[in-house]
């Protein structure tokens, strides 16, 4: 099943997020992703856990998953590089780099996103954008067009409360508010963008969505700058 949803969001402005990628398995949306270099898409490692026998591709330049759009193009994946420390049973190090079969054709609707290299926390209360094609309500309706939501970053101490994520949020993770508006299982791999810079990637651990006591969890890309650089080199 697709790993992803934006709950309580709204339809995104078409092609205003030219870095947005749909990671697809056998032609169907599986996870979000973000174009970080001409030939590389960053996503979540857990997205490919069940994809061993399937064909993984990356869709760029899309707003609608089904409708023809001049900017849309599906790329094969030359190489999938999960973070070496990612494991099926934890949310830690949940990053995946996908090398496209060729450099993406860049344009107004396809453009890499600058990613944060300064290893510092986003200040609590800062509003950040998360987007994806995951289901939009608890009944499981899947959107055809890209959805987004602007969420405030939550401080780690609150996120780590026993009633929330009970100490699971390491310094390499961050949280955002989840009160009825949330990213969830299948926006996994998608970008959390603050002021035009990629700060986080939606983790793909299973958790309840839209419950304010279970904030959204995101992998801090700045904490993995050395690994990203080493793979992209």
């Amino acid at each position: 099943p697709p790993r992803g949803r934006i709950l309580g969001g709204r339809e995104a402005e078409a092609h205003a997020r030219p870095y947005m990628a749909s990671v697809q398995l056998n032609g169907a949306h599986l996870c979000g992703g973000v174009l970080v270099a001409e030939q590389w898409v960053l996503s979540a490692a857990h997205c490919l856990e069940d994809a061993a026998d399937g064909k993984v591709q990356v869709l760029l330049g899309a707003h609608s998953l089904s409708q023809p759009e001049p900017s849309k193009r599906l790329y094969d994946v030359l190489r999938a590089v999960p973070h070496p420390d990612s494991q099926p049973d934890t949310i830690d190090h949940d990053l995946l780099l996908l090398q496209l079969s060729e450099k993406a054709t860049l344009g107004p609707a396809v453009r890499p996103l600058p990613w944060q290299r300064v290893d510092r926390d986003v200040a609590p209360g800062t509003l950040c954008d998360v987007a994806g094609w995951g289901i939009v309500n608890h009944a499981g309706r899947r959107p055809d067009s890209l959805q987004h939501v602007l969420l405030p970053v939550l401080d780690r101490a609150t996120c780590n409360r026993r009633t929330h994520h009970d100490g699971a949020i390491t310094e390499r993770l961050m949280c955002a508010e989840s009160n009825r508006r949330d990213s969830c299982k299948g926006d996994s791999g998608g970008p959390l963008v603050c002021g035009g810079v990629l700060e986080g990637v939606v983790t793909s651990g299973s958790r309840v969505c839209g419950n304010r006591k279970k904030p959204g969890i995101y992998t801090r890309v700045a904490s993995y700058a050395a690994w990203i650089d080493s793979v992209l080199a």
Epitope: A16, G125, T126, L150, P152, N179, R180, C194, G195
Partner: antibody
Framework: QVQLQQSGPELVKPGASVKISCKAS????????INWVKQRPGQGPEWIGW????????YSNEKFEVKATLTVDESSSTAYMLLSSLTSEDSAVYFC???????????????WGQGTSVTVSS | DIQMTQSPASLSVSVGETVTITCRAS??????LAWFQQKQGKSPRLLVY???NLPDGVPSRFSGSGSGTQYSLKINILQSEDFGSYYC?????????FGGGTKLEIK
């Protein structure tokens, strides 16, 4: 044209409460954060907090957490701010403002109400 | 809380001149900054978002620049309608504080 129409001026006694309204029109009310801002004569504005009408989530400046209560009525596309235990320090013009989206992740207060003057005097 | 310090507090200039107003944050705000213009008795008007970007309808004589803790608003060839007060505001964490303002007066 997006508009935020605020309620009229208020003259209230110390210790009393006052509820200011802000009626939004020409956009989807539940899609945008509504912010409240205080401005005393000759001073810079002060951010009080925001409310997101789609979820009733609020986020307040600690300085105003006890003073101001933010609510919305989705059916009438109206935001409210209740100011309680008023003192002379609360005499000011209060603005509501919409947090607009620009591009993918940029935002700023793009549309403002005309302001509501609150005077606290015995 | 992040403090926003604007300078100068007031400025007396003539129509046609170019002016620069500065805003200093007490810590890095990573370009999460807006500028507003406010006329006496009116609501603030958004001029710049994300430090450098102009919303639709704002004349190109206005420009924003800066990064880290230092930001500027430049007004090229001042027009009579540009007189009033100018405020910066940050959006990095909360509370979203404003600067104390710069009052632009006609010489």
């Amino acid at each position: 044209q997006v508009q935020l129409q605020q309620s009229g001026p208020e003259l209230v006694k110390p210790g009393a409460s006052v509820k200011i309204s802000c009626k939004a029109s020409a956009y989807t009310f539940t899609d945008y954060y509504i912010n409240w801002v205080k401005q005393r004569p000759g001073q810079g504005p002060e951010w009080i907090g925001w409310i997101f009408p789609g979820s009733n989530s609020t986020y307040s400046n600690e300085k105003f957490e006890v003073k101001a209560t933010l609510t919305v009525d989705e059916s009438s596309s109206t935001a409210y701010m209740l100011l309680s235990s008023l003192t002379s320090e609360d005499s000011a013009v209060y603005f509501c403002a919409r947090l607009g989206y620009f591009g993918s992740s940029y935002h700023a207060l793009d549309y403002w109400g005309q302001g509501t003057s609150v005077t606290v005097s015995s | 809380d992040i403090q926003m310090t604007q300078s100068p507090a007031s400025l007396s200039v003539s129509v046609g001149e170019t002016v620069t107003i500065t805003c200093r944050a007490s810590e890095n705000i990573y370009s999460h900054l807006a500028w507003f213009q406010q006329k006496q008795g009116k609501s603030p008007r958004l001029l710049v978002y994300s430090a450098t970007n102009l919303p639709d309808g704002v004349p190109s004589r206005f420009s924003g620049s800066g990064s880290g803790t230092q930001y500027s608003l430049k007004i090229n060839i001042l027009q009579s309608e540009d007189f009033g007060s100018y405020y910066c505001q940050h959006f990095w964490g909360t509370p979203w504080t404003f600067g104390g303002g710069t009052k632009l007066e006609i010489k």
